[in-house]
Interface confidence: medium
């Protein structure tokens, strides 16, 4: 059940968001979330994941990119991009959305 907390081994992740209590956190996986709100520059947040693993499944869109990894500090030096609106089924074999 992706909503239940993960009980696997924990990894240390870079934490850079308003919710961080310090420069790193410990979780089941690391996250980077890039969000663009209407009329604003994209905001990138780094942290830890323990709940809602299904968020890692999502395809990047023009508004949000939710990236997950599960090795030591794997979210530290990661830069995400927001993708075009065209679905991947119309772009077989190409990169991105």
């Amino acid at each position: 059940d992706p909503v239940k907390p993960s009980r696997g081994p924990l990894v240390t992740c870079t934490c850079e968001s308003p919710h961080c209590k310090g420069p790193t956190c410990r979780g089941a996986w690391c996250t980077v979330v890039l969000v663009r709100e209407e009329g604003r520059h994209p905001q990138e947040h780094r942290g830890c994941g323990n709940l809602h693993r299904e968020l890692c499944r999502g395809r990047p869109t023009e508004f949000v990119n939710h990236y997950c990894c599960d090795s030591h500090l794997c979210n530290h030096n990661v830069s995400l991009v927001l993708e075009a609106t065209q679905p991947p089924s119309e772009q077989p074999g190409t990169d991105g959305q």
């Epitope: 996986w29 990047p60 997950c68 990894c69 599960d70 030096n77 990661v78 830069s79 995400l80």
Partner: nanobody, 120 residues
Amino acid sequence: QVQLVESGGGLVQPGGSLRLSCAASGSIFRLESMGWFRQAPGNEREFVAFMLSGGTTDYADSVKGRFTISRDNAKKTVTLQMNSLKAEDTAVYYCYVEATTDRIGIKRYWGQGTLVTVSS
């Protein structure tokens, strides 16, 4: 650029098994998430399974207990073992990888797709 080559699709009877493989090549610095989506005719592409580099996995509810994802980081391959196949598993299966090619930028790359048909 990253290239993905899928194999293993085909026609199988209900209750049968298939093993899909996907090999990544190109100027890859690091591979993170690798996984599979599928798209049945007339439907949107839907998530099937993923596996992160450290072994974290997740599956769509419809395939849990029947499908198993695995990966070989050294060979840059991801495999989907599909057992107890049903007619509703018929779809084009697309593998994807989230890869770092330049030590910083992460992008998701897609394969061309391989057709799985479950029919008697």
